[in-house]
Interface confidence: low
């Protein structure tokens, strides 16, 4: 016996969040893994008085304590609809079915005399049917439904007389069913029987407050189990050759402070006081855990030496239950001020360390949904995915000997103190219906797929490719708004006087009269922050730099009456100094953010983008920028993410759609102006960049979710892309969806009607497609009332906790970008596409492994789109150059300009132009390739201020 469970909280220093196998493992379970599903008799059988069944303590408890529940009589009626249960089992394709025998259905008053014939026949028929189907039965003798007569006559499990009576009942079951049953469970989760039956009073028999009774009950349950195990071991195992255990349930807990010894001690105590209470005598040294003996000496019964010897080793495997009943409620004592956690993998590791690596059957696992959820139990899929992933990791990475898994539960039914307010079935049952049809939920389809594949196959992404991007590919980095320096920060050479220092010993400068020196004109490098920008860009080794101008700084009045020439000079310097390093600029004219609209003050006060005249003001501003910078800038973005301004103009859907309309017009006016006036001489290209996350159905088994995913793309991307790239009008699907909600009185929103002139103005006003892509969203359909953009879409988002995610919960889903690029090409034709921002936030200030992982994986998918799908991808701009103070850490540089290690990673990808074959010699000609100019770099770094 090892007892080293507490070591589990000393975290592995090698844990890396970007080794995805530590979050989710695409792998299969061992070859003969035992897949099953379970039910409890009281929960699903119904017929509590039918055919001679006696009442149980729960039948009584329901009538006395759960007044809003008539009885378990409705439930799923498994006693009547046995065939329907068997069909459900067939559907899923399980290897075993774990069910419990109702003690009072066999022996109405609990005492083993002549069994109730109808009850005996029911279980016999069930077992025969399972054997016929090649489904192994795992039979639980006691799942909480003690015959009421034994409670009333003896006081139930408080009285050790029950031990022998239980053994008689077990003997009968072994005799009658043992030829067909190879796996037996004596008692299901004795902790809950004792703690909630006699401590909190939440479970039958509903006694509470007497701690001595709680531990007496626990004591008798352990002795009852042990007696039955010895009985089976001696009299039945030799010829029946089965295995027997007891299902022990537990929560899991994490310390508040992972390095604090006291917190770790409390976590160990927490586990020991719940799981150890029963596991230590049975799987450990035969006695209660030392901590419990010390703490509860006044109420905890004592095992004699002989009893310890008798208890020890009385289980042929470790049957473990991990589900909501052990979490909610978790009594205060068990929580011990630490943090409850659903980390099944760690719980299994604790069992491995504490009980010397036993063979483990997960005898109950799953979560619950609200009773209103019918067959679309999306969150249940993700809970199951998470739990199963943790089990697989435990097997494959931690070498834990889990040999089987019981999904809980086959059917919706009576959920103890929660009665019918929650559902735990993989099959939906309408309790008010006569026929109690078993309808497979999404989770049933999901579990069926898991069983069929014996785990998780990697279907989402294809293997990495080797190859390179074209020689003219833009390798970029994006920055948000650059605030211009109003005055050059470096005034040297502008003062013509000569000074002598410390001439009189007073440590001051003294002007030398009569001497005048030559000054020099202002230079770009007088701007300190340009110097910083250039140093960072040079280290990035990019070919392109995307940054945004500050409209409010360039035109403080919002019109051309007051042009800030110094700001324009500053921006011209950024571009021209970049060009000296071989870095071209992609300039964004307008970059609003959630916190700051970035409009000139007068425009902001005149209703901003709700006012159509803002579009004309934007055209004038764009014209000024084209005129002043266009000789140097060949790639322009008019507006960054206009489709995200809905976050700001969100008072109503009509505000959102009105603002969007004016943004589209503003862009089109600017594009038309460039096309007419500047393109002939400047030969640049103009577009606008759209926020373009991909969307996947949260629940792939629900048609409504597939429709929601497409609807998300329509409302998010097509909303702007359709009018500009294609038709000059809003997407028909989006218009119709909003109109349909309007007709049904669910929304008063309406998309603006476009005139023929407006359609002509908008259509075709892009020279390339610019997409900002960060992540993939998992979407589900949910009908939402209200007249705002967010509710018009009828979409909710789901966070998949098994996915690698950033601190701001951006999921790393590389294959989403490839799907997006294909969708854009399919919908809008074969055009040049730039990914104008793509990146992830990463907490690390130096070794930003998450960002490196993200860049590598996402660029792989972009390369697949280029090489395999033949998408005309022209550039990738990583987001972003430097992080801002107190904002999520998206930067390659910290806010105080310290470089992170992802820069070298990106450098390597850029210099390789992707992911070339080993020894690939496909180099670009000198003119095309951006060779690093060592002298330039030296000058940038050393140029005096």
């Amino acid at each position: 016996f090892s007892g080293d469970g507490r070591a589990i909280w000393s975290k592995n220093p090698n844990f890396t969040p970007v080794n995805e196998s530590q979050l989710f493992l695409y792998d299969t379970f061992p070859k003969n893994f035992f897949w099953g599903i379970g039910t409890g008799a009281l929960q699903v059988e119904g017929s509590w008085k039918k055919d001679g069944k006696g009442p149980s303590i729960w039948d009584h408890f329901i009538h006395t304590h759960l007044k809003n529940v008539s009885s378990t009589n409705g439930s799923s009626d498994s006693y009547i609809f046995l065939e329907k249960d068997l069909s459900a089992l067939d559907f899923i394709g399980v290897s075993f079915y774990q069910f419990s025998i109702s003690w009072p259905r066999l022996f109405p008053d609990g005492i083993v005399t002549v069994a109730n014939a109808k009850g005996l026949q029911y279980y016999s028929t069930l077992l025969d049917a399972l054997v016929l189907r090649n489904i192994e039965p795992i039979v639980t003798l006691y799942h909480w439904d003690l015959p009421l007569a034994l409670q009333e006559k003896y006081g139930g499990w408080k009285n050790d007389t029950i031990i022998d009576i239980f053994n008689d009942y077990a003997t009968y079951c072994f005799q009658m069913f043992g030829d067909r049953v190879k796996y037996w469970i004596t008692i299901h989760n004795p902790y809950l029987v004792a703690w909630h039956g006699y401590g909190t009073g939440m479970h039958a028999p509903g006694e509470k407050g007497n701690l001595a009774a709680v531990y007496t009950v626990g004591h008798n349950l352990i002795k009852a189990h042990s007696k039955v195990w010895h009985n089976y071991n001696t009299h039945f195992r030799p010829h029946q050759k089965g295995w027997l255990s007891i299902t022990l349930g537990s929560h899991w807990i994490e310390p508040n402070r992972s390095e604090n010894t006291m917190d770790i001690f409390k976590c160990q105590q927490s586990m020991v006081s719940v799981l150890g209470w029963f596991a230590n005598p049975i799987h450990g040294d035969g006695d209660y855990p030392e901590g419990m003996r010390k703490k509860l000496f006044s109420v905890l019964p004592i095992f004699s030496e002989a009893e310890k010897h008798e208890m020890r080793g009385t289980a042929d495997f470790f049957a473990f239950s991990f589900g909501p009943n052990n979490f909610k409620p978790l009594n205060t004592m068990a929580k011990m001020g630490q943090n409850v956690s659903l980390n099944l993998r760690e719980a299994l590791n604790w069992i491995k360390l504490e009980y010397n690596n036993p063979r483990i059957l997960i005898a109950e696992n799953g979560w619950f949904t609200d009773s209103r959820v019918k067959t679309e139990d999306t969150t249940a899929i993700y809970m199951m995915k998470n739990f199963l992933s943790q089990v697989l990791q435990a097997i494959r990475l931690d070498e834990i000997r889990v040999f089987g898994y019981t999904a809980w539960s086959l059917l919706d039914g009576f959920e103890w103190q929660d009665a019918y307010t929650i559902r735990r079935g993989l099959f939906y049952v309408d309790f008010n219906s006569k026929q109690k049809e078993r309808k497979p939920k999404s989770s049933a389809h999901y579990y069926k797929q898991i069983i069929r594949e014996n785990g998780f196959s990697l279907k989402e992404s294809t293997p990495d490719v080797q190859g390179q991007f074209p020689c003219d590919f833009s390798w970029g980095v994006t920055e948000s708004v650059l605030k211009p320096e109003s005055v050059a920060s470096s005034p040297q050479f502008s003062d013509p006087h000569l000074y002598v220092w410390n001439a009189t010993g007073n440590r001051l400068l003294h002007r030398v009269e009569g001497v005048r020196l030559k000054t020099r004109p202002a230079q770009c490098t007088d701007f300190v922050n340009i110097k910083k920008q250039l140093e960072m860009l040079a280290r990035m080794k990019v070919t392109h730099y995307r940054f945004a101008l500050d409209w409010a700084s360039v035109l403080p009045t919002g019109n051309l009456s007051a042009v800030n020439r110094q700001a324009l000079r500053y921006y011209r310097c950024v571009v021209s100094e970049g060009l000296k390093l071989g870095i071209s600029a992609m300039v964004t004219l307008y970059y609003p953010t959630h916190a700051h609209l970035g409009l000139p003050e007068p425009l902001l006060h005149a209703d901003g983008w709700l006012n159509p005249s803002t579009a004309e003001a934007f055209q004038a501003y764009a014209g000024l920028c084209f005129q002043e910078l266009g000789d140097l800038v060949k790639l322009w973005i008019t507006i960054n993410e206009p489709n995200r301004l809905s976050d700001i103009y969100n008072r109503s859907g009509n505000d959102t759609y009105g603002a969007a309309h004016n943004l589209l017009v503003a862009h089109a006016l600017a594009w038309r102006l460039y096309d007419r006036q500047f393109r002939p001489s400047q030969r640049g290209a103009v577009s606008l960049s759209l926020h373009a996350d991909w969307a996947e159905p949260a629940n792939p088994y629900a048609d409504s979710h597939w429709r929601a995913a497409e609807r998300f793309l329509q409302f998010e991307i097509a909303w702007f892309a359709e009018p500009l790239f294609k038709t000059g009008d809003y997407p028909a699907a989006m218009r119709e969806y909003i109109a349909s909600k309007h007709r049904r009185g669910l929304s008063s929103s309406a998309l603006p009607r476009l005139t023929e002139a407006e359609r002509r103005l908008l259509k075709g006003t892009v020279d390339f497609c610019a997409l900002n892509h960060f992540t993939t969203r998992f979407v589900m359909h949910e009908q939402l009332a209200g007249s705002r953009y967010d509710s018009d879409r009828d979409i909710q988002f789901l966070q998949d906790i098994t996915r690698l995610s950033s601190p701001t919960r951006l999921a790393v889903i590389p294959w989403g970008v490839r799907k997006l690029l294909r969708w854009v090409r399919r919908n809008y034709g074969d055009m040049d596409i730039y990914i104008t921002a793509s990146g992830i936030d990463d907490q690390a200030l130096e070794d930003d492994r998450l960002r490196k992982y993200y860049l590598g994986k996402y660029l792989q998918e972009v390369l697949k789109a280029y090489l395999i799908d033949k998408v005309r991808i022209k550039g990738y701009y990583a987001f972003k150059l430097a992080e801002e103070k107190s904002k999520p850490r998206f930067g390659f540089f910290t806010s105080d300009f310290k470089a992170k290690s992802s820069i070298q990673f990106y450098n390597k990808v850029i210099s390789s132009r992707g992911f070339p074959f080993e020894n690939s010699s496909s180099r670009c000609s000198q003119t095309q390739e951006n060779t690093e100019c060592t002298v330039c770099l030296f000058l940038v770094q050393k140029k005096p201020l």
Epitope: N68, H196, K328, L330, N339, D418, T421, I422
Partner: antibody, heavy 124, light 109 residues
Framework: QVTLKESGPVLVKPTETLTLTCTVS??????????VSWIRQPPGKALEWLAH???????SYSTSLKSRLTISKDTSKSQVVLTMTNMDPVDTATYYC????????????????WGQGTTVTVSS | SYVLTQPPSVSVAPGQTARITCGGN??????VHWYQQKPGQAPVLVVY???DRPSGIPERFSGSNSGNTATLTISRVEAGDEADYYC???????????FGGGTKLTVLG
């Protein structure tokens, strides 16, 4: 739709007994998972819990006011009644009733629905 | 009896994050609930069971609880969040409800 509505006198004289009624709709008072509390708030001051009645009719009272309070319920009328004896001007406050639900546990998961409150002034 | 201590006031600029604390002896082992109360209105439950949000409460409201302090965090604070906030626990030993003294959240500007 779950609602609670408090009713009772607006003005009470010192030494008199205050009787407040909370009428509930949208749920049943004999639901095993529901309890009702009374809370008060003197003008400009914090919330102060007074009493609670559990689904099984068990009652719990604020220690400092226990001797003056009685809480009861009439399930058939969907009403919870609070009486407070020997009223004093310092008892001037807005009195709220609120529902608590156990969603899956031993403890209540907070007071999820409150009445709009009834203001009681104690003055001679 | 169990005592919950809250700071009388917290001020924060719009768009920033507000953190309101609730101190109590080993409060981490209790379930903490948080209420928002605007002038002239009844309290509204914004977080229950330490960190769960009732439906209709924005994701900006979150809670945590460990050791001797529970915290209500309101990210991206809006002017409409200006209100009094109360923490509450059930004292399991006495079956009493305990409220904190309340914190007035002021949104600057």
């Amino acid at each position: 739709q779950v609602t609670l509505k408090e009713s009772g006198p607006v003005l009470v004289k010192p030494t008199e007994t205050l009787t407040l009624t909370c009428t509930v709709s949208g749920f049943s008072l004999n639901n095993a998972r529901v309890g009702v509390s009374w809370i008060r708030q003197p003008p400009g001051k914090a919330l102060e819990w007074l009493a609670h009645i559990f689904s099984n009719d068990e009652k719990s009272y604020s220690t400092s006011l226990k001797s003056r309070l009685t809480i009861s319920k009439d399930t058939s009328k969907s009403q919870v009644v609070l009486t407070m004896t020997n009223m004093d001007p310092v008892d001037t406050a807005t009195y709220y009733c609120a529902r608590s639900v156990v969603t899956g546990g031993y403890y209540y998961d907070g007071m999820d629905v409150w009445g709009q409150g009834t203001t009681v002034t104690v003055s001679s | 009896s169990y005592v919950l201590t809250q700071p009388p006031s917290v001020s924060v600029a719009p768009g920033q994050t507000a953190r309101i604390t609730c101190g109590g002896n080993n409060i981490g082992s209790e379930s903490v609930h948080w209420y928002q109360q605007k002038p002239g209105q009844a309290p509204v439950l914004v977080v229950y069971d330490d960190s769960d949000r009732p439906s209709g409460i924005p994701e900006r409201f979150s809670g945590s609880n460990s050791g001797n302090t529970a915290t209500l965090t309101i990210s991206r604070v809006e002017a409409g969040d200006e209100a009094d906030y109360y923490c509450q626990v059930w004292d399991g030993n006495s079956d009493h409800v305990v409220f904190g003294g309340g914190t007035k959240l002021t949104v600057l500007g």
